[in-house]
Structure formats: structure tokens, C-alpha cells
Interface confidence: medium
Amino acid sequence: GITIPRNPGCPNSEDKNFPRTVMVNLNIHNRNTNTNPKRSSDYYNRSTSPWNLHRNEDPERYPSVIWEAKCRHLGCINADGNVDYHMNSVPIQQEILVLRREPPHCPNSFRLEKILVSVGCTCVTPIVHHVA
Amino acid sequence: GITIPRNPGCPNSEDKNFPRTVMVNLNIHNRNTNTNPKRSSDYYNRSTSPWNLHRNEDPERYPSVIWEAKCRHLGCINADGNVDYHMNSVPIQQEILVLRREPPHCPNSFRLEKILVSVGCTCVTPIVHHVA
């Protein structure tokens, strides 16, 4: 593992809950630099494996709104604009961190949580199982 | 709007830094029930818009390892296994929440940060610009 030298100016960690409970500054820093710019896109419509976006809202979670992708078809759209069932539309999933209020409704106490979200869909060659 | 009653058992918020700095429980609760993200692990190879996964490691960040997708081709793979440049492979991006050690190297003090990551690639019909 990578050893991190301890900064002498670090906050005190005498708390009996340490290291389970940490201090977090909530003024969010945005690291989305010019090297990775946001691009408004209609990929969800133009993809050969198009998807719909569903709003998932939870006031006890941050981010409170998460958009979930659901593939529109089992197959993929071919050059004629028809669904080709010899190919499969599949969701691309990613595990993300969210903060959940804990205890519920508390404005200044949270717990980290991992959730799996579908970000979009891609078209894949199916795995064909041959029956002996 | 949805009104959230305040929980009487909430932690104290008398700290002069409140509400910028809060306590976060790092015992991560995993809500990924009945899902197996491993199932999607070979999509990057089987997709018509395949991608490579690059490891981005930063010991000052949690999670310290993030995998970034880079599309292998400008075009998409056709039925013959060749790259078709009449279609485009594009990255699907998502903004995610991470924790950054602040001050650096401190084990129990963090700042929230938003970063933009490419999760995978999808094949899209290109936008053709007609010159007048």
C-alpha cells in the first residue's frame, strides 16, 4: 500500500469513533477541468442501444437526484432503424458514493453509502450458449 | 416542497464551523443488493464501441482508485468485425462524488469533490453538418 506521511497540522483523532467518523468539508470542490469538459449530449437518443433516463429522488441522500438509464430495447438499432435481436443492448453500470443522513433528518450527520447506477447503454455481441 | 421534521436526537451543531464541516461515518453501507457488477465486466470487449479501462490512482482521494474508460476506436465495430467510420464510438460520462484529504495526508479530514469520469462507450449515429 501507499504510505501517506502524516501532516502535523491534522485535526485531532482522539475521538473514540476514530477512524470510523471523519470531518468532511461540504463546500464541494469541482475538479471538472478543461481536459475532461462536460458535453451536453443526446447520446441516449442517437445510440444504437438507446436508453431512457428515470429520475430517482431521495431527500435523505446526496446527491438527492440520480438519473438511472434503462435500455429501450433488448436488441440494438441497425442501419435501417430497426431492432436487431442478434445483438443486445446492455446497461453500463457504475458504483458511486453517496451521503445518507444518519440518523434520518439530521442536517449535519451522514453515512457514506455505495450504490450501483446504470449510466447508459452499449450494444454488445451476445454470448451464445450451445446446448450439447 | 417536502417538509422534513428535525430529528431531536441529531448531533450537536454548535461548532463554529457548522454547517460547513460535518461528521461522516465511513463504515460504508452497500445498497447494491442482488446486483452483480462483475456481470458487466466484459462489456468493454464485447461492445460494438469497445473501450479500454485506465487505472487512475490518487492516495489523497477516496476512493483512491477510479477506472476511466477510453474508447478504442473513433468508429464502431460492424458485423464483420471491422471499424465502421460512418458511426462513432463516444464515452458515456458521469459526475461522481469523492472525498479528498484536506489538509493533504490527514487520515480523518476530508473535503467533498465532484469529478467527471468516463464509464464506458456507446455507438452513436454521427451528427452530419451540411455546409451551405
Epitope: 463546500n27 462536460k38 451536453s40 429522488e57 446527491p63 | 416542497g1 460547513r20 458515456i92 460520462q93 461522481i96
Partner: antibody, heavy 126, light 107 residues
């Protein structure tokens, strides 16, 4: 559709403080941010600061740092902007606006101000 | 801070004419630029978000384009109700900044 309703017009003397409210209805208050923007007579729009309502975390424009305080009360779905040490230069219309504050996912966007309050006219005069 | 400059400052236009307003950022802001319309004695209204996306309810005659440092708002076939001041706004980095505005008058 989120609707924002602001408190009424105010007349203040130099040196006094001002506190304007912005009551939100529709949608979940904790899922978006509230920003405050002001407009002096005949002038353009000037961002003063904002709050992430879920946390109560704030960001302020350097120009107003130390003079402005933005808060939010989830129980009443109301945001507040307090400005101290008023001078005649603070005469303006003050607007609150909703910042959707959603995480980017390629299409649904963050940080455009999609709903605005009706504005609160503030006059500072001795 | 990122400075936004708009041109022209003022435009007097005949109905049905095409109007083009430009906004230039002092540094690359990707597509994080939004346009607002403000009619006299009214609150600003979001017209275009992320350089080229139209929120629902905005008439199709309004369109946006550009990325990086140069952006354009176009009104194709101006109507009398479009009179007002148009502002660009960047959300790429704090502090959030607005352009000085372009006033559009109907001849």
C-alpha cells in the same frame, strides 16, 4: 415545477442589516440549491452567493464575503439572505433562484438557474 | 474570475428579423454557458442551458451554439414579445458570473 416566493419590499437606512426570505414550493427542497442574485437600478445581474440546501454549505462572492449570510430552513422550505452594513450602493432588486444542483450524467444538467423568485426591491437611503 | 463580454450592447430589430447575440468568455468554459431573457420589471427566465439545450416551454425560435470561449444566442424570426435584455451566465467555476447584457428593442 418549483416556485419561489420572496418577501416584500424593504426600505433601510445606511449601516442597517437586511434579511430577505425565499419560500420554495414544489419538488424536494433538499435536492437543489438556492442562489441569490441582485440587480442595481439599470444594471446587470450580479451573483452574491448560494447554498446547497441538503448540507447548508455556502459559497459567497468575494465582494460580499463577511457581509452576506445565506441560510436555509428545511422544515419551512425557506432560504434566507442576510446582508449587513448596508450602503446606498446596496439599493437593488434581490432575486433568489433555484440551482438544480444535479450531478452531471451527460444530459440532465446542473447549475443553470431554472426558476426565479419575483424579486425583492430594497432601497437604502438616509 | 471568468469575465463574460457580450455584443452588441443594444440592438433595434424589426419583427421577423433574425437576431444574433454573442458572448465571449475570458477562458475556456467548455459548454457551461446559459442564456437568460429578462423583460422589463420581470425576473430573468432561462432560455438556453449548456450552450445549446432548450428547456421545455421555450419557443423553438431561440437557439444557442458554441463551446470553449465563443457562444451565440440566435432568435430566428423575432416577435414583439421578445423585447428585453439577454444575459449569458457561466457556471464553469466560482464565482458565477454574468455578461453585461444585450438590450433588444422592437422597431
Amino acid at each position: 415545477e418549483v416556485q419561489l416566493v420572496q418577501s416584500g419590499a424593504e426600505v433601510k437606512k445606511p449601516g442597517e442589516s437586511l434579511k430577505i426570505s425565499c419560500k420554495a414550493s414544489g419538488g424536494s427542497f433538499s435536492s437543489y440549491g438556492i442562489v441569490w442574485v441582485r440587480q442595481a437600478p439599470g444594471q446587470g445581474l450580479e451573483w452574491m452567493g448560494g447554498i446547497t440546501t441538503f448540507f447548508g454549505a455556502t459559497d459567497y462572492a468575494q465582494k460580499f464575503q463577511g457581509r452576506v449570510t445565506i441560510t436555509a430552513d428545511e422544515s419551512t422550505t425557506t432560504a434566507y439572505m442576510e446582508l449587513s452594513g448596508l450602503t446606498s450602493d446596496d439599493t437593488a432588486v434581490y432575486y433568489c433562484a433555484r440551482d438544480p444542483n444535479e450531478f452531471w450524467n451527460g444530459y440532465y444538467d446542473t447549475h443553470d438557474f431554472d426558476s426565479w423568485g419575483q424579486g425583492t426591491t430594497v432601497t437604502v437611503s438616509s | 474570475e471568468i469575465v463574460l463580454t457580450q455584443s452588441p450592447d443594444f440592438q433595434s430589430v424589426t419583427p421577423k428579423e433574425k437576431v444574433t447575440i454573442t458572448c465571449r468568455a475570458s477562458q475556456n468554459i467548455g459548454e457551461e454557458l446559459h442564456w437568460y431573457q429578462q423583460k422589463p420589471d420581470q425576473s430573468p427566465k432561462l432560455l438556453i442551458k449548456y450552450a445549446s439545450s432548450s428547456p421545455s416551454g421555450v419557443p423553438s425560435r431561440f437557439s444557442g451554439s458554441g463551446s470553449g470561449t465563443d457562444f451565440t444566442l440566435t432568435i430566428n424570426g423575432l416577435e414583439a414579445e421578445d423585447a428585453g435584455t439577454y444575459y449569458c451566465h457561466q457556471s464553469f467555476s466560482l464565482p458565477v458570473t454574468f455578461g453585461p447584457g444585450t438590450k433588444v428593442d422592437i422597431k
